[in-house]
Interface confidence: medium
């Protein structure tokens, strides 16, 4: 009966294995998680443009229970938020506030999960029903992206790698199924 | 300190639509599953749905299926409960209340808000 | 459906007596019941999870038992600002249910 004690919070649970829809989108800067100090930015230096390796992503670790319907994980799961300034980037001065703020030089670096795992977890359900056994998609790790333009079509670019990522700007879906499917299977009546 | 402010009591006519809001304070709101009760006049106390604010996924009673949409917005930590088609049946106050760190138990519940059905 | 009976549709006491308000289900819920209190204002207070555990905050002189089907609140000693009505409510499995409510009231 230990389930009884755990926070509502949700972490994506993997319609069917082999299937890996992109995690929501309010993961990379969720007020519930742990956030870096400075606002996960590196530190300043002005007027200078810095090489796009020091300005790797910060991996910053949040814990929460899945849940599925009425159900709860046994064990809470660790997985890892991306957050951080990516490369290149300035310091430039902000004219009306005499202060300093940050703008991207050059192409558009993005900190964004890299790899992901899979973790198979218990969940408990109050009373009557049994345990069911749910895969859940975890952050295993970040790194900085570039996006750039290619046909028309924005992609975003590993250093090296290439990976067909969605349009900039455009809520990730799953690829074997439509965001409608998804909730529909997340509306539940009883 | 927790609170759960819901809108004052709506009029409204058979057949129209109604959307009653409950803001939630003290908290953070993406934490908690917020649930829709509803109390007919002299009544006792009938579970609705939840929803859960961090995907915006509800669960419902299958008796108010048809009846009842639950919606968050993150962004001003308000739930908000659309009640469609209405008739004289659903003239009630509609509760809503944070399921606490505990399962099933509502420990937060916001003051009510009143709808009357009449032409 | 999980049924929840108050047996007691109101109940009438004196202050400091010992109220015990019972809640019978349709089959067992192994404990998975919790008690509410909600003041003739409409304001509805959470009591007691998981049928004995009261909620921090809540007065010792609420207490609560049972087990399988049946389920009671005692009030030890009956204060003023006792007086409501008391509703029981299970979350064995969905949809949850809640008793009809026992009216509390003064003698």
């Known amino acids: 009966q230990g389930w009884q004690a755990f926070k509502n919070d949700a972490t994506e649970i993997i319609p069917e294995l082999g299937e890996y829809p992109e995690p929501p989108p309010e993961l990379e800067n969720n007020k519930t998680m742990n956030r870096a100090e400075n606002g996960g930015r590196p530190p300043h230096h002005p007027f200078e443009t810095k090489d796009v390796s020091e300005y790797s992503c910060r991996e910053l670790h949040f814990t929460r229970y899945v849940t599925d319907g009425p159900c709860r994980s046994a064990k809470p799961v660790t997985e890892l938020v991306c957050s951080g300034q990516c490369g290149p980037a300035r310091l430039l001065p902000n004219a009306i506030g005499r202060g300093k703020w940050w703008r991207p030089s050059g192409p558009d670096f993005r900190c964004i999960p890299d790899r992901y795992r899979a973790q198979r977890v218990q969940l408990l359900c109050p009373g009557g029903e049994a345990p069911r056994a749910r895969k859940v998609r975890l952050v295993a790790s970040c790194k900085c992206k570039r996006l750039t333009r290619f046909h028309n079509q924005s992609e975003l670019k590993d250093f090296g790698t290439e990976a067909a990522r969605p349009q900039k700007g455009r809520k990730p879906r799953p690829r074997a199924r439509s965001a409608k499917a998804n909730q529909a299977e997340l509306e539940n009546a009883y | 300190e927790i609170q759960l402010q819901q809108t004052g009591p709506e009029l409204v006519k058979p057949g129209a639509s109604v959307k009653i809001s409950c803001k939630a304070s003290g908290y953070s709101f993406t934490d908690n599953i917020m649930v829709w009760v509803k109390q007919s006049h002299g009544k006792s106390l009938e579970w609705i749905g939840n929803i859960n604010p961090y995907y915006g996924s509800p669960s419902y009673n299958l008796k108010f299926k048809d009846k009842a949409t639950l919606t968050v917005d993150k962004s001003s930590s308000t739930a908000y409960m659309q009640l469609n088609s209405l008739t004289s049946e659903d003239s009630a106050v509609y509760y809503c209340?944070?399921?606490?760190?505990?399962?099933?138990?509502?420990?937060?519940w916001g003051q009510g808000t009143s709808v009357t059905v009449s032409s | 459906d999980i049924q929840m009976t108050q047996t007691s549709s109101s109940l009438s006491a004196s202050l400091g007596d010992r109220v015990t308000i019972s809640c019978r289900t349709s089959?067992?819920?192994?404990?998975?019941l919790n008690w509410y209190q909600q003041k003739p204002d409409g304001t509805v207070k959470f009591l007691i999870h998981?049928?004995?555990r009261l909620k921090s905050g809540v007065p010792s002189r609420f207490s609560g038992s049972g087990s399988g089907t049946d389920y009671s609140l005692t009030i030890s000693h009956l204060e003023p600002e006792d007086i409501a009505t008391y509703y029981c409510q299970h979350y064995y499995n969905l949809p949850w249910t809640f008793g009809g409510g026992t009216k509390l009231e003064l003698k």
């Open positions: 089959q067992d819920i192994n404990n998975f």
């Open positions: 998981h049928t004995s």
């Open positions: 209340a944070r399921e606490g760190g505990n399962y099933g138990s509502l420990d937060n």
